[in-house]
Structures are given as C-alpha cells and as structure tokens.
Interface confidence: low
C-alpha cells in the first residue's frame, strides 16, 4: 500500500494510473466505501463524504489514463485508505495528515515558552525534530518545548516530520515580541534635553496594548511611575503623566520619550513596560540616564556624576590640551586651585570619551564661566 | 472584507451568448469555489454550477452542462460564467456566490440581469 | 437530484409572533451526524442572504430570532419574535450533495 503524508491546510494529489491511456470509469472511494468522486464520461461525479468541495480532479489529465484525488486545505481527520477503482482493479493509497502548531500563537514575549505540537492521525507514530532560526536542534515525539525564548529564535522554525521512512516539512514563522535592546544608556551633561527611545525589534499590523514607565532615581528612596500611556494600532497617547519631570511622548512607533532637561536628580533607572493586547505578560526595556555636572566653588573645582555607572569607568579633570590633573574610577574628582583655562570633565571607558563637561577657570578676582 | 462584485446588465438576441463577470477581492481569490445561481423574474434559485479558480475546475448541473463555461483569470481575481444558444428562458438575474466557514453560500454577488429579447 | 419543497408557499404574521417554515427533501441530507441544509432570506432586488447553515448554525451577525432545526429530510426555520423587517421570501437548499437545490420559496408578510 502506498503511503502519502500530507500537511494540514495543505493540498495534496493522489495519483491512480490505468494501464490505457484514454478516459475510462474510475471512482475514488474512502475506507468505508462512501464515494468521494468519480466520472461520467467527461462529467465529474461526487459523492456525499466529507470532503465536500475539497475535493477535486485534474480532467486535462484523464485522456492519458490519469485520474488523481486532489485533496484542499487538508485536515488530520482526512486521514485514511483511499481506494481507486479504475479498470476492475483497485488501487489504495494511505494518506496520513500531519499539522504541526505553536502554542496559542506565533507572536510570543521574549523569556516565555514555545511549545509547538503536532496533530497527527490515530495509530501513527511520527517523531520530529526541528531546527531554530540560530540552528539548535530540537526532538521530540507530539510535543517540543524551548524554554526562555531569545530574541534570535524570531524567524522560520523548520521541522521534518518523520513516518514511514517518509517526511513532510513544516515551516512555522515564530516572532519574539521584545525591545530591540534589553537595556540602554543615556549620558547627559546638566541641562540638556534627555531623549529616550525604545525601538521594538519586530513589526505587525497592529499593534495595540499599554505601557508605563517607572523611574527609579538614584537620591530617591522608591520608584516613581513618570508616565503612563495607551497604544493603539502603533497610535501614542499618554494617559498620565507625572508634572516633575513632565516628559513629552512621540504620537507614533516607535515609543520615543523626551524629558525636557537632565538634572542629578533624575539620575537613575527607569524600567519601561508594554503590555499588549491579547498577551499574557509584557515586554520590559531598562533605560538609564547618568548625569554629569561640573562646577566651580570658591578655590574648589568639582565634577560629579550621578545614574548607574559602572565601576571601571574613569572620571577625569584636566586642563585642555595638557594631561589628566586628577582621574578616578570615583562619581566625583575635584581640584583645589585650579589654574586659568578651560577645563574639561571626561567621563570614559577604557579611553573612549562618553561624557565630557567644559567649565572656564577665570583668574581668581572673577566668578567661573560655564559656556 | 469579502466582496463580490459583478458586471452589469446585458441585453441579448436569441441564440446569442453572455458572458457574466465577478470580481472577488477581500480574500485569496484561489482558496474558494465561486458559485453561480440563477434567478428568473419572481422565480426561485436554481445553482447552476461551480469553478475552483485555483485549477480551473469547473463542475455544472447537468441542466446547463451543454450551454455554461466558467472560467477563472487568477490574475484580476475574476471569475466568468458564459451562457451561450440564449432562449428567453434564459432571462434572469445571475448571482455569483462564495461559501463562508461553513456550508452555505455567506457571500454573493450583487447579480447581473440578463435579459434575452428579439 | 434531491428535490426540496416548501411549506407554506406564503404566510401572514403578525409583528411578536411565531412563523415557522419547513422544508422537506426527497432524500436525507444527513452525513456524519451533519445535515447539510441551509436556509435564506431575500429581499426584492438583493441577493439572498445566508441565515442558517448545517441547519441549525446561525450565521454571523443574524440575530437570534432565526433558529433552524431539523435532520434527515424534514426541516424547520423558525422567526420568533417576527418583526416588520422580516417581510422576504425564505429559501432552505441542501448542500448534500450535486446539483446544489433550493426549495421554491415561503413568502413572508408582515400583517
């Protein structure tokens, strides 16, 4: 008996030759003997199964003695023993129908699990292995599971399904719902306009949820929420939002947040949120903003940093164009009696400048200028 | 949404043929069977047969099997029913129809009066 | 062929009340625990719109005063409350098997 796997949703052709190459009676039958379809010299014929208009014939290909079952949109239970009756012979071929799905949905948040099951008919016993977008191999038997999904795992899964030393591939598109990046940084000198922006590292037609960002400064002793918003079909509009610091939000996609100017007391972390619709969980983005301030008083030049900043980072003054004076893996470095000039606070990490703050040294009968 | 969109009217001599368009958008033209069903003035529904644009598959009542072709074009996403040896028996709204998810027809054509007259 | 009639060919009914359509077939639609029946509604000049299918399924957005039942070949459509806009011609047709067949209709008038 010839065997044929076939995909779910898919079409498939069961071929049933005769010897002569001409139009003859034929007629497909399924395992209980009900008519599916069959001729009357040119005319097709159906019978009453259950496959209804899914079922058809390629009568171009009757005059050479073919006379195929073409099976749409395939479903588990149209597995069976399908006879063709052509030239007081029968012919049977066994079409199993496998489908292959993912848990609930394809569009799943970073850090959840991706279970895709396979449907297959009663009595077989296939086994499967499927290959992720970034190659990890994975097997199973009606169910495999990936814990902790990563943001590289978004693409094409691709999974052979095994039965009767035959195969049938299965391509299920698994999108990760994630910020582009986990975590961001922002370094700003005293007074300037801060911009954050929280880019999604996938695309749908609509887009739909709501988000928060909470904000933890550092000489705060608890978190405060800054703004609340609502998304509608990648729409923007705030619901609420804090009047110190009063941020401003971007009306469309991606979510770009502007607070009106950098202060040590916003210094810290803040964690955005995104819960959309239809999702169990959401999506998180850390963004955190370090602040720089330089300042002259009396006979002591100061420069500071306030936010989350690492500890092999240097914190530098120096006269321009001369050698460092001071610099520390401190969050503050100062220098008594600092000479005329310009000076230069350099915030940097093994040698690359991140932050860099200019205060004019004015001799000492003058008050400093802070360009 | 789904939509079937059909041509206008036509007026025919006796032993003449139509040929009646409808034009299917909202959906994937190839994944359903396009109906076509007659309607003689204040009569009822008579199915007249099936196409399936994918293939070109078309199956017809045995009343009209001598007399009806349909075809399919996949490229505009438009399906014909050609009618020829017109009688005036043959004057009648056409409708072209499209299941929904189960069995019966959920979508139909806005219809085509054929008027067949010396 | 699998003929379908109709009874009444026309009834009269009053806004609130019951009207009850049957359709007979010359052979069981039955396949499989499914009845393949369908019912319509038309209105002058549009094309008929699908009430009922696998006789007893309410179509989406049909309001729930149309009910259908039914197996084997004898079908009912059921308009309960009846209201003015209901005035149409009713149509059951088996997709059992081809050809297709629609009965030859119920006219309903709102009295």
């Known amino acids: 008996k010839k065997v044929v796997l076939g995909k779910k949703g898919d079409t498939v052709e069961l071929t049933c030759t005769a010897s002569q190459k001409k139009s003859i009676q034929f007629h497909w039958k399924n395992s209980n003997q009900i008519k599916i379809l069959g001729n009357q010299g040119s005319f097709l014929t159906k019978g009453p199964s259950k496959l209804n208009d899914r079922a058809d014939s390629r009568r171009s290909l009757w005059d050479q003695g073919n006379f195929p079952l073409i099976i749409k949109n395939l479903k588990i239970e149209d597995s069976d023993t399908y006879i063709c009756e052509v030239e007081d012979q029968k012919e049977e071929v066994q079409l199993l129908v496998f489908g292959l799905t993912a848990n609930s949905d394809t569009h799943l948040l970073q850090g959840q699990s991706l279970t895709l099951t396979l449907e297959s008919p009663p009595g077989s016993s296939p086994s499967v292995q499927c290959r992720s977008p970034r190659g990890k191999n994975i097997q199973g038997g009606k169910t495999l599971s990936v814990s902790q999904l990563e943001l590289q795992d978004s693409g094409t899964w691709t999974c052979t399904v095994l039965q009767n030393q035959k195969k049938v591939e299965f391509k299920i598109d698994i999108v990760v719902l994630a910020f582009q990046k986990a975590s961001s940084i922002v370094y700003k000198k005293e007074g300037e306009q801060v911009e954050f922006s929280f880019p999604l590292a996938f695309t749908v037609e609509k887009l739909t949820g709501s988000g928060e960002l909470w904000w933890q400064a550092e000489r705060a002793s608890s978190s405060k929420s800054w703004i609340t918003f609502d998304l509608k079909n990648k729409e923007v509009s705030v619901k609420r939002v804090t009047q110190d610091p009063k941020l401003q939000m971007g009306k469309k996609l991606p979510l770009h947040l502007t607070l009106p100017q950098a202060l040590p007391q916003y210094a810290g972390s803040g964690n955005l949120t995104l819960a959309l619709e239809a999702k169990t969980g959401k999506l998180h983005q850390e963004v955190n903003l370090v602040v720089m301030r330089a300042t002259q008083l009396q006979k002591n030049l100061t420069c500071e940093v306030w936010g989350p900043t690492s500890p092999k980072l240097m914190l530098s003054l120096k006269l321009e164009n001369k050698e460092a004076k001071v610099s520390k893996r401190e969050k503050a470095v100062w220098v008594l009696n600092p000479e005329a000039g310009m000076w230069q606070c350099l915030l940097s990490d093994s040698g690359q400048v991140l932050l860099e703050s200019n205060i004019k040294v004015l001799p000492t009968w003058s008050t400093p200028v802070q360009p | 949404q789904v939509q079937l969109v059909q041509s206008g009217p036509e007026l025919k001599k006796p032993g003449a043929s139509v040929k009646v368009s409808c034009k299917a958008s909202g959906y994937t033209f190839t994944d359903y069977v396009i109906h076509w069903v007659k309607q003689a003035t204040g009569q009822g529904l008579e199915w007249i047969g099936e196409?399936?644009?994918?293939?070109?598959?078309?199956y017809s009542n045995a009343k009209f099997k001598d007399r009806v072709t349909m075809t399919a074009d996949k490229s505009s996403n438009t399906a014909y029913m050609e009618l020829s040896s017109l009688t005036s028996d043959d004057t009648a709204v056409y409708f072209c129809a499209r299941r929904g998810n189960g069995t019966g027809f959920a979508y139909w054509g806005q219809g085509t009066l054929v008027t067949v007259s010396s | 062929d699998i003929v379908l009639t109709q009874s009444p060919a026309s009834l009269a009914v009053s806004p609130g009340q019951r009207a009850t359509i049957t359709c007979k077939a010359g052979q069981s639609v039955d396949y499989d625990g499914d009845s393949y029946m369908n019912w319509y509604q038309q209105k002058p000049g549009q094309p008929p719109k699908l009430l009922i299918y696998v006789a007893s399924n309410l179509e989406s957005g049909i309001p729930s005063r149309f009910s259908g039942s039914g197996s084997g070949t004898d079908f009912t459509l059921t308009i309960n409350p009846v209201e003015e806009n209901d005035t149409a011609t009713y149509y059951c047709?088996?997709?059992?098997?081809?050809?297709?067949?629609f009965g030859p209709g119920t006219k309903v008038e709102i009295k």
């Open positions: 047709q088996q997709s059992y098997k081809d050809p297709l067949a």
């Open positions: 196409i399936y644009p994918g293939s070109g598959s078309a």
